[in-house]
């Protein structure tokens, strides 16, 4: 396993609809054709997998149908979107990139993006 640099933004604020997007960029050390991207969430020293996708270079990023993540790839950067977020989902979201094929295998883990989610205030009843 060889190490690889990964960069991602330090902080992202989710929209009022609970959607957060960020870029994950990696320093590809060679001609990888198969790449796996995983988003991990770290909160209270617990790390859980949020979503993962494997893609072939030049093809679209495809997550499982029930995934809360969507994304697109362009060269050695991936644009990730996480949906359905609520205030309790606030935490550090880490981008993990693996170059699966051809060998050698490379692994890169970003420093994480702190995603802040604020639940919207319910609309007050209207008198009109």
């Amino acid at each position: 396993c060889k190490a690889m640099h990964v960069a991602q933004p330090a902080v992202v604020l989710a929209s009022s609809r609970g959607i957060a997007s960020f870029v994950c960029e990696y320093a590809s050390p060679g001609k990888a054709t198969e790449v796996r991207v995983t988003v991990l969430r770290q909160a209270d020293s617990q790390v859980t997998e949020v979503c993962a996708a494997t893609y072939m270079m030049g093809n679209e990023l495809t997550f499982l149908d029930d995934s809360i993540c969507t994304g697109t790839s362009s060269g050695n950067q991936v644009n990730l979107t996480i949906q359905g977020l609520r205030a309790m989902d606030t935490g550090l979201y880490i981008c993990k990139v693996e170059l699966m094929y051809p060998p050698p295998y490379y692994l890169g883990i970003g420093n994480g993006t702190q995603i802040y989610v604020i639940d919207p205030e319910p609309c007050p009843d209207s008198d009109f």
């Epitope: 320093a27 050390p29 990888a32 270079m57 030049g58 060269g75």
Partner: nanobody, 126 residues
């Protein structure tokens, strides 16, 4: 859209040095990571070096590490490849390529670059 033009190639004796330039027009190069590659007749394109947008991140394959150095001058919209201790096997056409990125990293994979120069010939011979 950015366009790239390489220069600085030519004939050099074994053990000599050359500095290649990759000049950009049509856009500011500081928005792009840049890579240098080469292709010899009958061989696959080979990665040589890359440099991130700010110049703080560079990467080289083991085959040229220590002999080749990549640098950039964003004020001149130019990226350079300094090549020392040249050998006959360094004879090839040298290309630079650019990729628009968000952060400071770069890639050594030719698959990641979407804009390429026309190339400059380097011949190492006595």
């Amino acid at each position: 859209e950015v366009q790239l033009v390489e220069s600085g190639g030519g004939l050099v004796q074994p053990g000599g040095s050359l500095r290649l330039s990759c000049a950009a027009s049509g856009d500011t190069l500081e928005s792009f990571a840049v890579g240098w590659f080469r292709q010899a007749p009958g061989k696959e394109r080979e990665e040589l070096a890359c440099i991130g947008r700010t110049g703080e991140f560079t990467d080289y394959p083991g085959s040229v590490k220590g002999r080749f150095t990549i640098s950039r001058d964003n004020s001149k919209n130019t990226v350079y490849l300094q090549m020392n201790s040249l050998r006959a096997e360094d004879t090839a056409v040298y290309y630079c390529a650019a990729e628009r990125l968000v952060f400071h990293l770069c890639s050594l994979s030719e698959y990641d670059y979407d804009t390429w120069g026309q190339g400059t010939q380097v011949t190492v011979s006595s």
